[in-house]
Interface confidence: low
């Protein structure tokens, strides 16, 4: 089998075997490597000579295979723009950001650029749990059958109607979507709205 | 030559205490992100927590965040691990490894020879 | 937290098989993925990362390839020095997590 061209070598065809680690050097019209990520080029190839390498500073990175001549500055989460740092930059990624609890992302430019806070789920309603947090803003849905949620809140969650048999009480009032059952004691006198009204 | 050197392990009972210490040689210990790595018997690789250059950083998994405490003196080219209310669970090699990516780590490149700990009544 | 699966967890060669080992992560990690070599009785050995960057003295009949979620680490024509456990890691967001390990036995 042919031997596999060790970098530089001469390609008239503008393509070189290796579209990841290597580039097309056109003044020389010859095959590169390119750098490997968390490195940049410190000096460029030549006809007798591969790119030399070199390590990206602190506080930089560069994240893929690259014949660029710097590495990238690491920029922090801004909380001002409500992000929180996941994990920090290293050499061969950029900080990970995410929105900060509470918020959803407003702009996406590749990455969030802008989270604004979730709006709230009014009272009887709760937001539709999303498979990523921090995605989009809240969907308000109605409470299902037998819940009942009694607040304005971005997170707060339906929660069951009270069994007031379970309590060894019996129902005064019926829940709502908006409110609990309303248990009393059974030798309790019926409140005066409910009067005449025979409790089963 | 790099090097990383870990002592301080032993036998403890459960609940109780340990600091392990891992001495660098070698390199600028100060540039480097480090980190501890942990292994129990016949099972595989448990990454347990990682500390940045200047030890303003610190990062835990959940297994033993609030537990343990990851820690550096740069004066001394030391890495710490102090290990509080130990589980049996607990039990296993616990390696320091320094991370090639300068002060802020994601790729072990130099790793201890490892150090046993072992929690047990 | 993000986990790692790798496949086969154990497998027999010869001498000069092609070896492939599969790692796949829970959700996507780009190319943030390392492999290690460990033999028994010792510490890990950073083979590759980056997914694909060789580390600087590992033999190139060591590869690795893959980005997202799917992740590929080749042994070209397996050598004796070659039979051990391999792990591959993620490095996403913390806490990173290492796969449980693939175990490369001589048949």
């Known amino acids: 089998s042919q031997p596999q061209a060790v970098p530089p070598y001469a390609s008239e065809n503008q393509t070189c075997r290796d579209q990841e680690k290597e580039y097309y050097e056109p003044q020389h019209r010859i095959c590169c490597s390119r750098c490997p990520p968390g490195t940049y080029v410190s000096a460029k190839c030549s006809r007798i000579r591969d790119t030399v390498c070199a390590t990206c500073a602190e506080n930089s990175y560069n994240e893929h295979w690259n014949y660029l001549t710097i590495c990238q500055l690491c920029r922090p989460c801004d909380p001002v723009m409500g992000l929180e740092e996941i994990a920090p930059c290293t050499s061969k990624r950029k900080t990970q950001c995410r929105c900060q609890p509470g918020m959803f992302c407003a702009a996406w430019a590749l990455e969030c650029t802008h989270c604004e806070l979730l709006s709230d789920c009014p009272p009887g309603t709760e937001a539709e749990l999303k498979d990523e947090v921090g995605k989009g803003n809240n969907h308000c849905v109605p409470c299902k059958a037998g819940h009942f949620q009694n607040t304005s809140s971005p997170s707060a969650r339906c929660q069951p109607h009270t069994r007031c048999e379970n309590q060894g009480l019996v129902e005064a009032a019926p829940g709502t979507a908006q409110s609990d059952t309303t248990c009393k004691n059974p030798l309790e006198p019926l409140p005066p709205e409910m009067s005449g009204t025979m409790l089963m | 030559e790099v090097q990383l050197l870990e002592s301080g392990g032993g036998l403890v009972q459960p609940g109780g205490s340990l600091r392990l210490s891992c001495a660098a040689s070698g390199f600028t210990f100060s540039n480097y992100a480090m980190t501890w790595v942990r292994q129990a018997p016949g099972k595989g690789l448990e990454w347990v927590s990682e500390i940045s250059g200047s030890g303003g950083s610190t990062y835990y998994a959940d297994s033993v965040k609030g537990r343990f405490t990851i820690s550096r003196d740069n004066s001394k080219n030391t890495l710490y691990l102090q290990m509080n209310s130990l589980r049996a669970e607990d039990t296993a090699v616990y390696y320091c490894?320094?991370?090639?990516?300068?002060?802020?780590?994601?790729?072990?490149?130099?790793w201890g020879q490892g150090t046993t700990v072992t929690v047990s009544s | 937290d993000i986990q790692m699966t790798q496949s086969p967890s154990s497998l027999s060669a010869s001498i000069g098989d092609r070896v492939t080992i599969t790692c796949r992560a829970s959700q996507d990690i780009s190319n943030y993925l390392n492999w290690y070599q460990q033999k028994p009785g010792k510490a890990p050995k950073l083979l590759i990362y980056a997914a694909s960057a060789l580390q600087s003295g590992v033999p190139s009949r060591f590869s690795g390839s893959g980005s997202g979620t799917d992740f590929t680490l080749t042994i070209s024509s397996l050598q004796p020095e070659d039979f051990a456990t391999y792990y591959c890691?993620?490095?996403?967001?913390?806490?990173?997590?290492f796969g449980q390990g693939t175990k490369v036995e001589i048949r």
């Open positions: 490894a320094k991370d090639d990516d300068g002060a802020y780590g994601d790729t072990m490149d130099v």
């Open positions: 890691q993620h490095y996403k967001s913390y806490p990173y997590t």
